[in-house]
Interface confidence: low
């Protein structure tokens, strides 16, 4: 098909006359608004068909779509159609009139629709508003079609300004109809069962009166059919339930169970699936790692957590040094085992304001008639270090010694430092580290003892100072993973008559 002029969009003057020509290899015809306007059809000597549409005394109402199509499309390979859009800017025509049914837009699902308000002039600015609102809505506008987007159930009008007057369109009403779609839910009494136990599944549909259920399941594939039971839940309107019950499950019953529901009125359907696992026997399985050495800080609370999978539900016991633990009435220990999913459990032992005596060997045991698992770890109580004693003495040898004693868990490190300029120490001058050099000035001797009952280390360190010629600030710092503590003593030379 050949259209002259080709378009696809033309802007014509009001009151003018315009000729449209369409030609093709078979009879052709012009269509306007599903009608065939008066036109001149001809057949040329070369066998070409044509149709001439003469538009006279054009007005804004001539704005719109024009189609050229084959008069009789039978026998042609393609149902070809050429579209042309003509604008006739006309200040006397505001918005092009709509048929009554175009003012009411019905939809059954959330989908894009078009509010078909059109003007005669492609240069005009058109805005969309809610019927009772002044704010222009941010919806794209196509001069040939209107506003397209997703709209709520409201009334809308279009506005434009022609010359100096504001023009409103008719109101458009958008209605969303509630067609009952199928919504299926499937659940099982248990998704994990032991062989010999029952599998029971339920498939529920809401909001429909007549539906058809179809189950697919592993047993069906081997030709062993199970007859489901369908019932209505009387206390809930339009709740229909199908129950699939397989007594004495076998290992081969593991797999996917699918409930497919159809309703014939609107030809809707939905399906949901659920996985069922049939196990040979029950199990208890630890999930994740728990280090075999755990730490808690003295006087702080500590929760020790073990995550495991089990079926059937297990009994969980906690032991300390082979003695069973229970929730203490004093609130010092709290035990809890939570079911976080059908087969997953979290067991927690909470020690409130941890005491040294709570260090030891802890075991969690989860068991049922088929299986058991134990998890053990050593709990170490970390105690912040403290310097218990820092003293200075003058042995007969002439050297001066400083002794530092402290305790903590884990084993504290000891750091000796000294400062000679008392006025500027330690704010301005950093102290000098002692005991880790090969200089003869100082000598260090450190002993470490582990006190079993208190479950902590004691560090005793003696610093020997060969020669002290002026007052010296000596600092002993103890450090471990949970803290540090420092004490300071001023060492004066033998010759000075006083000590600070």
């Amino acid at each position: 098909l050949v259209v002259t002029p080709p378009g696809p969009e033309l802007v014509l003057n009001v009151s003018s006359t315009f000729v449209l020509t369409c030609s093709g290899s078979a009879p052709v015809v012009w269509e306007r608004m599903s009608q065939e306007p008066p036109q001149e059809m001809a057949k040329a000597q070369d066998g070409t068909f044509s149709s001439v549409l003469t538009l006279t005394n054009l007005t804004g109402l001539d704005t719109g779509e024009y189609f050229c199509t084959h008069n009789d499309s039978r026998g042609l390979e393609t149902d070809e159609r050429k579209r042309l859009y003509i604008f006739v800017p006309d200040p006397t025509v505001g918005f092009l009139p709509n048929d009554a049914e175009e003012l009411f837009i019905f939809l059954t699902e959330i989908t894009e629709i078009t509010i078909p308000c059109r003007v005669t002039d492609p240069q005009l600015v058109v805005t969309l508003h809610e019927k009772k609102g002044d704010v222009a809505l941010p919806v794209p506008y196509d001069h040939q079609r209107g506003f397209s987007g997703i709209f709520e159930d409201r009334s809308y009008i279009c506005k434009t300004t022609i010359g100096d007057r504001e023009v409103d369109s008719d109101a458009y009403y958008v209605y969303r109809l509630q067609v009952s779609s199928i919504n299926v839910s499937v659940n099982a009494v248990q998704t994990v069962v032991r062989q010999g136990e029952n599998i029971t599944l339920m498939c529920i549909v809401i909001g429909n009166e007549v539906v058809n259920f179809e189950w697919t399941y592993p047993r069906k594939e081997s030709g062993r059919l199970v007859e489901p039971v369908t019932d209505f839940l009387l206390d809930m309107p339009y709740h229909i339930r199908s129950i699939l019950h397989i007594p004495s499950a076998e290992l081969e019953d593991s797999g996917t169970y699918t409930c497919n529901v159809t309703e014939s009125v609107n030809d809707h359907q939905d399906e949901k699936a659920i996985n069922i696992t049939v196990v040979e026997s029950g199990y208890v399985r630890l999930l994740g790692e728990v280090g075999t050495l755990q730490f808690a800080e003295l006087h702080r609370s500590r929760t020790l957590q073990v995550v495991f999978e089990a079926y059937p539900p297990p009994t969980v016991l906690w032991f300390k040094d082979n003695r069973t633990l229970g929730d203490s009435s004093a609130g010092e220990i709290a035990l809890s085992t939570r079911n976080v999913s059908e087969t997953r459990y979290v067991s927690e032992l909470t020690l409130v304001r941890v005491k040294v005596a709570e260090a030891g060997h802890y075991t969690m045991r989860a068991f049922h008639e088929d299986a058991e698992v134990q998890l053990s770890f050593q709990l170490q109580i970390n105690v912040p270090v403290r310097v218990l004693e820092l003293s200075e003495s003058h042995p007969d040898s002439g050297e001066q010694t400083v002794r530092c004693r402290g305790r903590g868990m884990p084993q504290p490190n000891i750091i000796w430092s000294a400062c000679r300029d008392l006025k500027r120490c330690p704010r301005e001058l950093p102290p000098t580290l002692l005991g880790n050099s090969s200089e003869e000035e100082s000598q260090l001797e450190t002993n470490v003892t582990y006190w079993e009952e208190e479950q902590e280390f004691e560090v005793v360190s003696t610093l020997r100072l060969q020669h002290v010629d002026r007052p010296l600030s000596v600092r002993c710092t103890l450090r471990n993973a949970v803290g540090q503590d420092t004490q300071e003593v001023i060492v004066v030379p033998h010759s000075l008559p006083f000590k600070v």
């Epitope: 399985r285 790692e289 280090g291 075999t292 050495l293 698992v373 053990s376 770890f377």
Partner: antibody, heavy 125, light 103 residues
Framework: AVTLDESGGGLQTPGTALSLVCKAS????????MAWVRQAPGKGLEFVGE????????FYAPAVKGRATISRDNGQSTVRLQLNNLRAEDTAIYYC??????????????????WGHGTEVIVSS | LTQPSSVSANPGETVKITCSGS???YGWYQQKSPGSAPVTLI????QRPSNIPSRFSGSKSGSTGTLTITGVQAEDEAVYYC???????????FGAGTTLTVL
């Protein structure tokens, strides 16, 4: 990602001692047992030994018992295999391995869940 | 631990490799060439690490562990070792290895 880098392999003389070091990264080293596994030329995998996460327990294969010592430094995330009195049959690729699992009161069960690329040791005069 | 020395299969077939011993828990390891680092396929009889394809699965019946490869592929050609996980008295042990040939 878990990485295990072995070092210390090479040509060794029979009767001498071997020291292999494995540097670990990408996981909480102090929470996991570590193991050494070797593979002699043309042979299968052979467990050498394992050390518990706190270094409180070590387990050795019969072929190296009495000659092997596995130690670890949780601060540096390293594990060391010392093998004394080397023999020609100690020639192998030595793999450092991260062992996961659970220690129970009576024993440990573990499996290897990460492997190093291996370091080759040749014992020859 | 006892396992067959070799098995062969055509692409797409299912292969089962057994490992018999007295372990309560088996692991399975794949080594594609001698001297290359092994890869852990299965631990604790049937647990599969997240980076291992689902065609590898493990099971245990009685005292025998089984590694199953469903729909074998050319790249699965390798030596497969089973290992026990008991550490009560000595270090763990490995089977002698099974060579899988994909025809």
């Amino acid at each position: 990602a878990v990485t295990l880098d072995e070092s210390g392999g090479g040509l060794q003389t029979p009767g001498t001692a071997l020291s292999l070091v494995c540097k670990a990264s990408g996981f909480t080293f102090s929470s996991f047992n570590m193991a050494w596994v070797r593979q002699a030329p043309g042979k299968g995998l052979e467990f050498v030994g394992e050390i518990s996460n706190t270094a409180g327990s070590t387990f050795y294969a019969p072929a190296v018992k009495g000659r092997a010592t596995i130690s670890r430094d949780n601060g540096q995330s390293t594990v060391r295999l010392q093998l004394n009195n080397l023999r020609a049959e100690d020639t192998a690729i030595y793999y450092c391995a991260k062992a996961a699992g659970t220690c129970y009161s009576h024993s440990c069960t573990g499996y290897i869940d990460a492997w190093g690329h291996g370091t080759e040791v040749i014992v020859s005069s | 631990l006892t396992q067959p020395s070799s098995v062969s299969a055509n692409p797409g077939e299912t292969v089962k490799i057994t490992c018999s011993g007295s372990s309560s828990s088996y692991g399975w390891y794949q080594q594609k060439s001698p001297g290359s680092a092994p890869v852990t396929l299965i631990y604790e009889n049937n647990q599969r690490p997240s980076n291992i394809p689902s065609r590898f699965s493990g099971s245990k019946s009685g005292s025998t562990g089984t590694l199953t490869i469903t729909g074998v592929q050319a790249e699965d050609e390798a030596v497969y070792y089973c290992g026990n996980a008991d550490r009560s008295n000595s270090a763990g042990t490995f089977g002698a290895g099974t060579t899988l040939t994909v025809l």
